[in-house]
């Protein structure tokens, strides 16, 4: 339904508060280096303009597209050329090329200072002094660091952020109340950002069909009682929502997400029995709750899949009549029967089935050719099952930190060209799969683990794409979305890698390490471990363990010393020499 003024339409649908918040997020995700005050000024100007259009939809410029209006506004920034370099060239383009240009310049790893959390009293004062600015600052800081963060979900995070301060700044022990809540929001926020980044990568790098296949599988697992037509409708609507958000169309995205939540709640009887509680919540909580809702119970009397997809003589006829619909039905039927499989495994099975039909339906006797197609699934199912079993055993034996270290060594040997900070970040996140998923029973392990690994490996892929250094990473990232994890798992030690020259500076530590949090100290040690492997890729586990144990003892000893700095200088030289000898550097 066409509206005379798109900006007025969205302002009225979303309300002023959400409109302003979403425009701020959009601008911060595009111009990630701009100061907060500049963005607030731009947002206020857009909001005032939107109000004039609400009053009179025929007013000047009110008929322009949102991309035109927002792009024109972004292109008024005076320092665009010196701050963003070639991104300023986007402003010479016309829509839709200009928006595409802005999207291409989004930076997954912007050069921004780490967010340092002030003292609780300082934060509470700032919150009370100007609540609106305080919350806008939160949106701005998250959005510019996470340029693909799911905007309507960020509104939900901001609501929880506000609630935490409202409650805790009045508490007797403000810190005890607030800090755990902020930690939880930070961790959940990083996870949410990474999950959304995979959705956008799926759409942008592999196309709508790939995203729709993912959505069919996931929604069929979640809503196994829903009919295929219902799942298909939800998939179409969900694809539109994520296409809009990933494309920077945040107002449309938030509006459509609200409509989808409304539709789901109005039709919960034909979708899932688990939606009742979600649907009683206010909008932002409702949408979040639906997105996270547990899988409904599988219908009791589902017939065997083989009848329709293997034994029937009409398989090729049905496939010819509507290939994607038939494959979609296969994926739906398989996924609703297998909440115990990862989405990526289900997609691999569907791809195998498709490949088999492509080959067999061209044969004179197709049925004879595809009769054993389900036998081809067995090794595809067993591979992730075995991998998860082995790695959960290793995790239980080592604990999270040492499990991360094992993965650090494993991945550094596979792709040693990748930057050390990226290897540390990705391997630490890969290692978190243990505490996240290994506690689950068998039936929940694979969907937890392999779908989480897909999210983490996508982080590696998007970071590597910015500055490509490894053909092996590029290959695993670009060849197949669903085979990324098996591709990385299959990589052996890179025999072509020329070891990095030894640099003592890399292994020089100072007393400041003693004041770091446990997490930061781990990162320092893990950074050193990656550098060790880059210097000596053929070092054995035993050699690396010995050096790392010595290193831990050295840090502990010097942090207890009276003259810490002298200890680090003198003992550090000895440690470097001993390590060089132990590793034959």
């Amino acid at each position: 339904d066409a509206h005379k003024s798109e900006v007025a339409h969205r302002f009225k649908d979303l309300g002023e508060e959400n409109f302003k918040a979403l425009v701020l997020i959009a601008f911060a995700q595009y111009l990630q280096q701009c100061p907060f005050e500049d963005h607030v000024k731009l947002v206020n100007e857009v909001t005032e303009f939107a109000k004039t259009c609400v009053a009179d939809e025929s007013a000047e410029n009110c008929d322009k597209s949102l991309h035109t209006l927002f792009g024109d506004k972004l292109c008024t920034v005076a320092t665009l050329r010196e701050t963003y370099g070639e991104m300023a060239d986007c402003c010479a383009k016309q829509e839709p090329e200009r928006n595409e240009c802005f999207l291409q310049h989004k930076d997954d790893n912007p050069n921004l200072p780490r967010l340092v959390r002030p003292e609780v009293d300082v934060m509470c004062t700032a919150f009370h002094d100007n609540e609106e600015t305080f919350l806008k600052k939160y949106l701005y800081e998250i959005a510019r660091r996470h340029p693909y963060f799911y905007a309507p979900e960020l509104l939900f995070f901001a609501k929880r952020y506000k609630a935490a301060f409202t409650e805790c700044c009045q508490a007797a022990d403000k810190a005890a109340c607030l800090l755990p809540k902020l930690d939880e929001l930070r961790d959940e926020g990083k996870a949410s950002s990474a999950k959304q980044r995979l959705k956008c990568a799926s759409l942008q790098k592999f196309g709508e069909r790939a995203f729709k296949a993912w959505a069919v599988a996931r929604l069929s697992q979640r809503f196994p009682k829903a009919e295929f037509a219902e799942v298909s409708k939800l998939v179409t609507d969900l694809t539109k929502v994520h296409t809009e958000c990933c494309h920077g169309d945040l107002l449309e995205c938030a509006d459509d997400r609200a409509d989808l939540a409304k539709y789901i709640c109005e039709n919960q009887d034909s979708i899932s029995s688990k939606l009742k509680e979600c649907c009683e919540k206010p909008l932002l909580e409702k949408s979040h709750c639906i997105a996270e809702v547990e899988n409904d119970e599988m219908p009791a009397d589902l017939p065997s899949l083989a009848a329709d997809f293997v034994e029937s003589k009409d398989v090729c006829k049905n496939y010819a009549e509507a290939k994607d619909v038939f494959l979609g039905m296969f994926l739906y039927e398989y996924a609703r029967r297998h909440p115990d499989y990862s989405v990526v495994l289900l997609l691999r099975l569907a791809k195998t089935y498709e490949t088999t039909l492509e080959k067999c339906c061209a044969a004179a006797d197709p049925h004879e050719c595809y009769a054993k197609v389900f036998d081809e699934f067995k090794p595809l199912v067993e591979e992730p099952q075995n991998l998860i079993k082995q790695n959960c055993e290793l995790f239980e034996q080592l604990g999270e930190y040492k499990f991360q270290n094992a993965l650090l060594v494993r991945y550094t040997k596979k792709v040693p060209q990748v930057s050390t900070p990226t290897l540390v970040e990705v391997s630490r996140n890969l290692g978190k799969v243990g505490s996240k998923c290994c506690k689950h029973p068998e039936a929940k392990r694979m969907p937890c683990a392999e779908d989480y690994l897909s999210v983490v490996l996508n982080q590696l892929c998007v970071l590597h794409e910015k500055t490509p250094v490894s053909d092996r990473v590029t290959k695993c990232c670009t060849e197949s979305l669903v085979n990324r994890r098996p591709c990385f798992s299959a990589l052996e030690v890179d025999e072509t890698y020329v070891p990095k020259e030894f640099n003592a500076e890399t292994f020089t530590f100072h007393a400041d390490i003693c004041t770091l949090s446990e997490k930061e100290r781990q990162i320092k040690k893990q950074t050193a471990l990656v550098e060790l492997v880059k210097h000596k890729p053929k070092a054995t586990k035993e050699q690396l363990k010995a050096v790392m144990d010595d290193f831990a003892a050295f840090v502990e000893k010097c942090c207890k010393a009276d003259d810490k700095e002298t200890c680090f200088a003198e003992e550090g030289k000895k440690l470097v020499a001993a390590s060089q000898a132990a590793l034959g550097l």
């Epitope: 003589k313 009409d314 090729c316 006829k317 496939y319 010819a320 009549e321 004179a364 006797d365 049925h367």
Partner: nanobody
Framework: QVQLVESGGGLVQPGGSLRLSCAAS????????MSWVRQAPGKGPEWVSA????????RYAESVKGRFTISRDNAKKTLYLQMNSLKPEDTAVYYC????????GSQGTQVTVSS
């Protein structure tokens, strides 16, 4: 929208010949094996012959082997059945199908063999 339109049937004397055609549209014809199936009055469908997508592999029911020849022209998206030495028991509605299906998705063409 998949469409299969058969033609070429008719009344023929025993020992005579007919050439049936099946014009296909709405799918990638050359990527699919095709079959001819027939259904005599009061009987179930009977598979007659099949051909692979490239036209290299052909299969026949024992009852028609040596008398019928299946072929295809992928450029014209058309399937053929050359029927020689026709017998009264060949009387049926003939229809073409995709893959090994015996489900009737088209009108078919009537073949009557009678003196």
């Amino acid at each position: 929208q998949v469409q299969l339109v058969e033609s070429g049937g008719g009344l023929v004397q025993p020992g005579g010949s007919l050439r049936l055609s099946c014009a296909a549209s709405g799918f990638t014809f050359g990527s699919f094996g095709m079959s001819w199936v027939r259904q005599a009055p009061g009987k179930g469908p009977e598979w007659v012959s099949a051909i692979d997508g490239g036209g290299a592999d052909t299969r026949y029911a024992e009852s028609v082997k040596g008398r019928f020849t299946i072929s295809r022209d992928n450029a014209k998206k058309t399937l053929y059945l050359q029927m020689n030495s026709l017998k009264p028991e060949d009387t049926a509605v003939y229809y073409c199908t995709i893959g090994g299906s015996t489900s009737r998705g088209s009108q078919g063409t009537q073949v009557t063999v009678s003196s």
